[in-house]
Interface confidence: low
C-alpha cells in the first residue's frame, strides 16, 4: 500500500504566446486538476478505467479572465493531489493530468466545466524515490509538475511489497516510527516459493509467489504479452527459443481489469488493482468519491462500496469514464457524400456540389419543387434530374418549343410534317415505313409484310415521337 503524490507547480501559456481557449468565459473562473493513473506502459484503450486510482484537486482561487489574454500564470489550487494505492506499486504506469476551468456563471445544470489541457505520459517510477519533475506542453499551455510514489508503512521497497516490521518491540520506542526503511531494521521478508522471480515476483506469506503487473506464471517469469510464445503448449518451443510453461490456472490471465494472477494449489488468486475486487477483479469498487469521470462527466451512484458508479458523459464523450471522445462523424451524419467536420461544439457538413442543408439532405438537382413546363415529367437519376418533355417541347425544363422535324427524321427524301401526336413522314416513291426507312423491292414485294389496306407506298406514315418501332 502507498500513495502517489502529484504537485502542480504552475499552469500557464507556454513559450511563444497566449493560448486561446475554445470556450469564452463570461464570468469568474477557477482552476482544478484531475489525475488518473493506469497500470502499464502500453497504450491502453482510452476508455479503460483509472485502475490505479484517480483524484480531483480542490478548486483554485477565483480569477477573472482578461478579454485579451489569460494571466501569465493562472492561480492554482493548494495542496497535493494524492492517489492512494492498496496493492503493489506497478513501477510502470500511465499518468494523465487534466486541467479544468470552472465557470461560475449562471448556467443550467451547475457551473460549466471546460477542459483547458490534458497531458498523458507513460512513466517508470520506483516507489520510495525522490520527486520526479516534469514540464509538459498541451497545445499552447505549459504544465509544470512533480510526482512521486511513496509506500505507507509497514510496506517498503520499490513496489511497496516488502513488509517492514520491527524485530522486537524494544527496538522502537514510544512515538517513533515502527522501523526505518533499512533492511537490517526490518523483519526479514518472508521466504518466497523457490525460484520465484526476484525481479517480477514477491510474496507476503512464506512459500507463495505473487506477480507484479505484466508478469504471470507460477514463478512470475512469463510476461503477459502478445509475444510469439503465447498460444504454444508444451515445455518449450524450439522454434522461438521461448520457455513456455504447460497449462496452468493462470494461463490467459483470468484476472480482469489489470489484476495479476498467482497460482495456488489447484487454483489461482487475483491481486486486484485499486478500485476492483472479486474472484477475478471483475467487480468495480471505485466510487464517485474517487472522481472517476473525466471530461466533465457527472458521476452517479457508487454511494457505497458495493454499488457501481456510472459516469454521465457530456455530449462528445463516451466510455465508462467519459475518457473517449466520440467520433461523431463515424455515425455518418452527412448525407449524399458530404464531408463531416467535428468542430467539437458542433458538427458541420461540407456538401458536394448539388446538395445543401445542415446534413446535405437537400438535393438541389432533384425533382422536389422542380416542375417541368408544358406537361413534361421529371425523372431523377444520379444526383441530377432531367425532364422528359411532352411532344413539341424540349430543353432542360421543357420551356423551349421543339420542332420534331428539325432532326430530319424521314429517310430517303421523305417529307416531314409535324403532327399533334408526333411527326408524319410522307415517303418518296419506292420507300415505306414510319421513317421511310424500308425500300419497296422492284418485283413489287416489300421487305416487310404487306401494308394494311388503304395505306399505299408513298402515303404519309404516322410516327409518334416517343415510339421507336414502325407501325403498319
Amino acid at each position: 500500500a502507498g500513495v502517489f503524490e502529484l504537485q502542480i507547480h504552475s499552469f500557464g501559456p507556454g513559450p511563444g504566446g497566449a493560448p486561446r481557449s475554445p470556450y469564452s468565459a463570461r464570468g469568474p473562473c477557477r482552476l482544478f486538476f484531475r489525475v488518473c493513473l493506469k497500470p502499464g506502459l502500453s497504450e491502453e484503450a482510452a476508455e479503460s478505467p483509472c485502475a490505479l486510482g484517480a483524484a480531483l484537486s480542490a478548486r483554485g482561487p477565483v480569477y477573472t479572465e482578461q478579454p485579451e489574454a489569460p494571466a501569465p500564470d493562472l492561480p492554482l489550487p493548494n495542496g497535493l493531489l494524492q492517489v492512494p494505492f492498496r496493492d503493489a506499486w506497478p513501477g510502470t504506469f500511465s499518468l494523465i493530468i487534466e486541467t479544468w476551468r470552472e465557470e461560475l456563471g449562471d448556467q443550467i445544470g451547475g457551473p460549466a466545466w471546460s477542459l483547458l489541457a490534458r497531458v498523458t505520459r507513460r512513466r517508470r517510477l520506483a516507489a520510495g524515490g525522490p520527486w520526479a519533475g516534469d514540464i509538459q506542453r498541451a497545445g499552447a499551455w505549459e504544465l509544470r509538475f512533480s510526482y512521486r510514489a511513496r509506500c505507507e508503512l509497514p510496506a517498503v521497497g520499490t513496489a511497496c511489497t516488502r513488509l517492514c516490521r520491527p524485530r522486537s518491540a524494544s527496538r522502537c520506542g514510544p512515538g517513533l516510527r515502527p522501523c526505518a526503511p533499512l533492511e537490517d531494521e526490518c523483519e526479514a521478508p518472508p521466504v518466497c516459493r523457490a525460484g520465484c522471480s526476484l525481479e517480477h515476483g514477491f510474496c507476503e506469506q512464506p512459500g507463495e509467489c505473487r506477480c507484479l503487473e505484466g508478469w504471470t506464471g507460477p514463478l512470475c517469469m512469463v510476461p503477459v504479452s502478445t509475444s510469439s510464445c503465447l498460444g504454444l503448449r508444451g515445455p518449450s518451443s524450439t522454434t522461438t527459443g521461448c520457455l513456455v510453461p504447460g497449462p496452468g490456472p493462470c494461463d490467459g490471465n483470468p484476472c480482469a481489469n489489470g489484476g495479476s494472477c498467482s497460482e495456488t494449489p489447484g487454483s489461482f488468486e487475483c491481486t486486484c488493482p485499486r478500485g476492483f475486487y472479486g474472484l477475478r477483479c471483475e467487480v468495480s469498487g471505485v466510487t464517485c468519491a474517487d472522481g472517476p469521470c473525466f471530461n466533465g462527466g457527472l458521476c452517479v451512484g457508487g454511494a457505497d462500496p458495493d454499488s457501481a458508479y456510472i459516469c454521465h458523459c457530456p455530449p462528445g464523450f463516451q466510455g465508462s469514464n467519459c475518457e473517449k471522445r466520440v467520433d461523431r462523424c463515424s455515425l455518418q451524419p452527412c448525407r449524399n457524400g458530404g464531408l463531416c467536420l467535428d468542430l467539437g461544439h458542433a458538427l458541420r457538413c461540407r456538401c458536394r456540389a448539388g446538395f445543401a442543408g445542415p446534413r446535405c439532405e437537400h438535393d438541389l438537382n432533384d425533382c422536389a419543387g422542380r416542375a417541368c413546363a408544358n406537361g413534361g415529367t421529371c425523372v431523377e437519376g444520379g444526383g441530377a434530374h432531367r425532364c422528359s418533355c411532352a411532344l413539341g417541347f424540349g430543353g432542360r425544363d421543357c420551356r423551349e418549343r421543339a420542332d420534331p422535324c428539325a432532326a430530319r427524321p424521314c429517310a430517303h427524301g421523305g417529307r416531314c410534317y409535324a403532327h399533334f401526336s408526333g411527326l408524319v413522314c410522307a415517303c418518296a416513291p419506292g420507300y415505306m415505313g414510319a421513317r421511310c426507312e424500308f425500300p419497296v423491292h422492284p418485283d413489287g414485294v416489300s421487305a416487310l409484310p404487306a401494308a394494311p389496306p388503304g395505306l399505299r407506298p408513298g402515303d404519309p406514315q404516322r410516327y409518334p415521337h416517343h415510339h421507336h418501332h414502325h407501325h403498319h
Epitope: Q107, I108, G110, C313, Q318
Partner: antibody, heavy 118, light 108 residues
Framework: QVQLQESGPGLVKPSETLSLTCTVS????????WTWIRQPPGKGLEWIGY???????NSNPSLKSRVTVSLDTSKSQFSLNLSSVTAADTAVYYC????????????WGQGTMVTVSS | EIVLTQSPGTLSLSPGERATLSCRAS???????LAWYQQKPGQAPRLLIY???SRATGIPDRFSGSGSGTDFTLTISRLEPEDFAAYYC?????????FGGGTKVEIK
C-alpha cells in the same frame, strides 16, 4: 425553440408492452441526453430512464428489467418500451431533455396519458 | 436510493406572502445536485432551480433555492397568483434519479 412531442397508444392491455415515441424538434438529438418520466394520476414524479445518442442508457432499477429506451437519430426520435404492464403503470408519461452539465430536466413534452386496462 | 421527503404536504398562503418549502434527503447529496420544479394542473413540470441555488433561464428572482448536504429549501419571497401550484425537488447525485413527493401551494 426546442420542442418535444410524445406519441403512442393511450390504452394498453395488461401484460402487453407500452410503446411511446418522443419526437424532438428545434435542436439536434445528438447534443443532449433524453429521458422519460412518469406521473401516476394524483401522485408524484418517477424517473424511468435516459438515453444518449452514443448508446449510453440507464434506467430506474425498480423498472429496469421491463424498460427499453432507444433512439433514432435519423428521425430525431427516442422511444420507451415498457413490457408486462399492469394497472400500476397507468400514468402520464413525459419525455424530457437532460441538460448536459447536470441531470436536471430543463425541457419537457406536454405528456401523454396511458391507461392500462383490459 | 436517495429518498427525498418534502414538507409540508400542503401550504395554504395568500398572494404576497412568503412561501418556504423543504426537501430533506435520506443521505447526503454531494455537489448540491438538487433541482426544483413547478407543476400546474394539466401541465408538464417546469425547471425552476438547479444546483440547489441557481435559477433556470427565465425564472423570476422571487424564486430562490438554498441548502446543502441533506437539507434544501425553496423560497418564494412574495407569492404571485401564478405561483400557486405543486413543487417537486429532484436529486441528480445518485442513480436512480429521484423526486420528492411534492408540496402543494394553495390559495388560503
Amino acid at each position: 425553440q426546442v420542442q418535444l412531442q410524445e406519441s403512442g397508444p393511450g390504452l394498453v392491455k395488461p401484460s402487453e408492452t407500452l410503446s411511446l415515441t418522443c419526437t424532438v424538434s428545434g435542436d439536434s438529438i445528438s447534443n443532449y441526453y433524453w429521458t422519460w418520466i412518469r406521473q401516476p394520476p394524483g401522485k408524484g414524479l418517477e424517473w424511468i430512464g435516459y438515453i444518449y445518442y452514443s448508446g449510453t442508457t440507464n434506467s430506474n432499477p425498480s423498472l429496469k428489467s421491463r424498460v427499453t429506451v432507444s433512439l433514432d437519430t435519423s428521425k430525431s426520435q427516442f422511444s420507451l418500451n415498457l413490457s408486462s404492464v399492469t394497472a400500476a403503470d397507468t400514468a402520464v408519461y413525459y419525455c424530457a431533455r437532460v441538460f448536459n452539465r447536470g441531470f436536471a430536466f430543463d425541457i419537457w413534452g406536454q405528456g401523454t396519458m396511458v391507461t392500462v386496462s383490459s | 436510493e436517495i429518498v427525498l421527503t418534502q414538507s409540508p404536504g400542503t401550504l395554504s398562503l395568500s398572494p404576497g406572502e412568503r412561501a418556504t418549502l423543504s426537501c430533506r434527503a435520506s443521505q447526503r447529496i454531494s455537489n448540491t445536485y438538487l433541482a426544483w420544479y413547478q407543476q400546474k394542473p394539466g401541465q408538464a413540470p417546469r425547471l425552476l432551480i438547479y444546483g440547489a441555488s441557481s435559477r433556470a433561464t427565465g425564472i423570476p428572482d422571487r424564486f430562490s433555492g438554498s441548502g446543502s448536504g441533506t437539507d434544501f429549501t425553496l423560497t418564494i419571497s412574495r407569492l404571485e397568483p401564478e405561483d400557486f401550484a405543486a413543487y417537486y425537488c429532484q436529486q441528480y447525485d445518485t442513480s436512480p434519479l429521484t423526486f420528492g413527493g411534492g408540496t402543494k401551494v394553495e390559495i388560503k
